[in-house]
Interface confidence: low
């Protein structure tokens, strides 16, 4: 037999919350358990599903879960079936709804002194209790002129008057929870004694010294009062006008007329209507003085033929918004065609050369009119007046290449040299007419030049080759003063270039011939062995047929190059002692000796008492200090050459003799002791 160990039982449940109907069976063989709701099998869903043999509810639903549930256990082999006791839910819920008009049938039928009934469509189980609100303030039962029927969820206003006007809402609460109306009801019951707007004043814009009219009307029973105020709350009446509103008139119908309006009259005007009962109604309107600013200037425009272009006219700031139109040759442009106005834009489609000229943008409003011209140029492709020609330019002189063109607008000319843009600097200058000036022609200026003349419509270009006529010159010019070492071989070069390869020869300045041990080999003066007699003035002469000759004078000095007889040695000196750095040099002319210490030249006139440079070139430093340490350089120089040699100077503390050392122990390094 099938036995129910646990049977489902009726229970309270909360709408939307979890619940479980328990069912457990015991049987000799396998059984399958299913559930019935009001006799129909229960299908599993995500919300309601079998959990073992129990039935689980993820969220109880008052509509889908109302009825009688039964647990059925069936042995499919024997056909035996057992059913549990019935179980149902007592589902607690509350659901919001709107506040609706129950009586009369429509809002149009609501009149003063009629009965008005409102219904609160909040429902629930157990039945909730209701609370009504007007404009957010609770209404309690038993107050005058209204009754609340909790059973029928109604609020009755008997009789309804203007004082009942407002926004009605309701809330309800029960053991399950609380809800408030999803949509509220606005009750509007007119009171004939309240002022109502018939005609409201509008903002006006007027030109200076024109007139302005504001209309304002209210209705009520008995008729309401009407008053006009200006910004500073000064009342405006025909009897008492503020000083700045002397020309104001208030008509019997409530309209306000202002004549010969001035800037001080601009501002906010308030029209106030007051009924016998109820609040005052304040209406506002603003008087604006019309104005128009100046228009911004247009940049001249350059367009190309065949293109489509637009010119936007930005309207000037103004009140009211200025209207804008374009004119050309005194005629207003149409809104369609080839040249036309579109919005604030001037549109030129498929531009022709004849479209060039002055176009005028006009803007106007009550305050006046403004205009601004734009000059439109239709660009043409440049044409040649004079192309650049292949030219021969003389080295060292200015050279000119023409590039004369004409077009509208004036064309821009740029020059290229070997395909590289020439930028103006100290050597190149492009004149306004396009001519290129090379200020001082150099040999490497001999190349291809190209000029390009451009306008927005297009460009033309031409090129020319420049050949540089080289001047006769020394390359490089010989040094005017040179030294040769006595009893050694020496060469003095001289080379030159010109339009034709020049011949080069040397001569002595006094005209005497060169000794046999001196040869002139293609411009190089060669001394097999320099003697004292070779000193003197020499002239290098370069010449060719077309350019004549040039001369360079050279003074040759014969010298015995410098050698050091005595060089300074690495020296270590006790602090406070005297250091001697010896240096002697020989040469012809007799060399002068200078010392450099710690990277600065030691000026004999500014050495101070501790340092001295002897006639023979030796440097002595008395009372040496640690800061005297460093490298000292002896520099020997004459008019022909210069040599240097250096040695370090170390200044050390005098050691204190240790007891173990005898009185005559030598120092551990080479010392100068004084």
């Amino acid at each position: 037999a099938i036995v129910f160990i646990k049977q489902p039982s009726s229970q309270d449940a909360l709408q939307g919350r979890r619940a479980l109907l328990r069912c457990e069976v015991e049987a000799p063989g396998p059984v399958h358990v299913y559930w019935l709701l009001d006799g129909a099998p229960v299908q599993d869903t995500e919300r309601r599903f079998a959990q073992g043999s129990s039935l689980s509810f993820a969220a109880v639903d008052r509509l889908q879960d109302s009825g009688t549930f039964q647990c059925v256990a069936r042995d499919d082999v024997t056909g035996e079936e057992a059913r549990s006791a019935n179980a149902s839910f007592n589902i607690k819920w509350i659901e919001a709804g709107p506040v609706v008009l129950k009586h009369p049938a429509s809002e149009a039928e609501i009149q003063p002194q009629t009965q008005v009934t409102l219904r609160c469509h909040i429902d629930g189980h157990p039945r909730p209790t209701y609370q009504w609100f007007r404009d957010g303030t609770p209404l309690s039962d038993g107050q005058s002129n209204h009754t609340v029927s909790s059973k029928e969820r109604n609020l009755t206003l008997r009789p309804a008057g203007p004082e009942h006007s407002g926004l009605y809402s309701c809330c309800a609460h029960s053991a399950f929870g609380q809800a408030c109306s999803s949509q509220n009801f606005t009750l509007s019951i007119a009171d004939e004694s309240f002022a109502r707007v018939v005609l409201a004043p509008q903002d006006v814009v007027v030109a200076r010294y024109e007139e302005a009219m504001f209309h304002c009307q209210f209705s009520a029973q008995p008729p309401p009062s009407l008053q006009w105020l200006f910004e500073d709350e000064t009342p405006i009446t025909n009897r008492s006008r503020p000083p700045h509103l002397r020309r104001a008139t208030v008509f019997a119908n409530g309209s306000l007329l202002l004549t010969q309006v001035r800037p001080r009259n601009a501002g906010i005007y308030r029209c106030i209507g007051q009924g016998q009962r109820g609040p005052p109604i304040i209406l506002e309107a603003t008087l604006h003085l019309a104005e128009i600013e100046d228009m911004p200037l247009f940049e001249p425009r350059v367009f190309t033929a065949g293109s489509e272009e637009r010119v936007t006219c930005l309207p000037p700031k103004g009140l009211p918004e200025p209207s804008v139109w374009w004119e050309h040759a005194g005629v207003r442009l149409p809104t369609h065609g080839r040249v036309y106005q579109k919005g604030h834009e001037l549109v030129l489609a498929n531009i022709a050369e004849s479209d060039a000229g002055v176009y005028t943008c006009h803007a106007a409003n009550l305050a006046g009119q403004r205009r601004q011209d734009v000059n439109i140029t239709v660009a043409t492709v440049p044409s040649w007046l004079k192309k650049p020609q292949d030219s021969q330019l003389e080295e060292g002189k200015p050279g000119y290449l023409d590039c004369l063109t004409q077009a509208t607008p004036k064309p821009t000319v740029v020059w290229y040299r070997n395909q590289m843009l020439i930028s103006e600097d100290s050597r190149f200058e492009v004149f306004k007419n396009g001519t290129l000036r090379i200020n001082s022609v150099e040999v490497y200026d001999g190349t291809w030049y190209r000029c390009m003349s451009s306008t927005p419509a297009g460009s033309i270009e031409a090129q020319a080759r420049v050949q540089v006529l080289e001047k006769l010159k020394f390359t490089p010019p010989p040094q005017p003063q040179q030294c040769m070492e006595f009893d050694k071989e020496a060469t003095v070069p001289c080379s030159a270039t010109g339009r034709e390869k020049p011949t080069i020869k040397w001569e002595r300045a006094d005209g005497s011939s060169l000794p046999e041990w001196v040869t002139d080999n293609a411009g190089t003066l060669h001394f097999a062995r320099v003697t004292r007699d070779d000193a003197g003035n020499y002239t290098c002469i370069a010449s060719n047929g077309p350019q004549g000759q040039i001369r360079a004078h050279v003074q040759l000095t014969v010298a015995v190059f410098i050698t050091f007889k005595v060089e300074p040695e690495r020296t270590t000196v006790y602090q406070g002692h005297t250091a001697l750095l010896q240096c002697e040099a020989q040469g012809d002319p007799k060399p002068l000796i200078q010392w450099k210490g710690k990277d600065r030249i030691l000026d004999p006139t500014k050495l101070g008492p501790r340092m001295h440079i002897f006639q023979n070139g030796s440097l002595v430093i008395h009372d040496v200090a640690p800061e005297d340490s460093g490298r000292y350089t002896c520099i020997a120089g004459n008019s022909c050459n210069i040599k240097h040699t250096e040695a370090p100077l170390y200044v050390v503390d005098k050691p204190v003799p240790e007891e173990s050392e005898g009185p005559g122990s030598p120092p551990p390094y080479k010392m100068i002791q004084t």
């Epitope: 843009l421 930028s423 600097d425």
Partner: antibody, heavy 120, light 111 residues
Framework: EVQLVESGGGLVQPGGSLRLSCTAS????????MSWVRQAPGKGLEWVGM???????YYASWAKGRFTISRDTSKNTVYLQMNSLRAEDTAVYFC??????????????WGQGTLVTVSS | EIVMTQSPSTLSASVGDRVIITCQAS??????LSWYQQKPGKAPKLLIY???KLATGVPSRFSGSGSGAEFTLTISSLQPDDFATYYC?????????????FGQGTKLTVL
Amino acid sequence: EVQLVESGGGLVQPGGSLRLSCTASGFSLSTYAMSWVRQAPGKGLEWVGMIYINDNTYYASWAKGRFTISRDTSKNTVYLQMNSLRAEDTAVYFCARDIGISYYIGVSLWGQGTLVTVSS
Amino acid sequence: EIVMTQSPSTLSASVGDRVIITCQASQSIGTRLSWYQQKPGKAPKLLIYGASKLATGVPSRFSGSGSGAEFTLTISSLQPDDFATYYCLGEYSYTTTAGIAFGQGTKLTVL
């Protein structure tokens, strides 16, 4: 409005390639010399190369062989093709107009730059 | 290739100070030199061109001088907006080569 807008920057692995674009608006690229300039994070400006209106190209010595500048006048765009990228190529790359002759005409126009990061 | 050497690389100054930045080219470039100002995250802005000409919209307290290989940028009376990095730019062009070189920059900071 006359302006230059660079694009194509991003993260690339060492040894990889990237092509930057610089699109001009408000003027025609075909009539101007265009340069690429780069700036490594926290470092100074460094010229990469330029293309003249006759399509001649010039490069900084370090960029020769790896970087190529070209342009498509129909698209009003100049390009910088960067190959064999290294970590030290990480920089903001600017496209600039006229800087080669700014000393002469007193005007130069720059884009806002695009960041190239070379990292593994 | 040309090399542009700027000095100093950093410079601290106060509002109202007179500031001088120098730029040396490794070879003569005539007056083919411009000065640029750059603020963080922005593109450079042209200040001086042709070594000494003031670009449009640049205050007159900025001035440039020099030619050949030695150039200077002077700010006569430093303003708060002038704290930025300044670069010189040299241009060279010959028949076989052309190019541009920037100085390494001078960062101008508040003292």
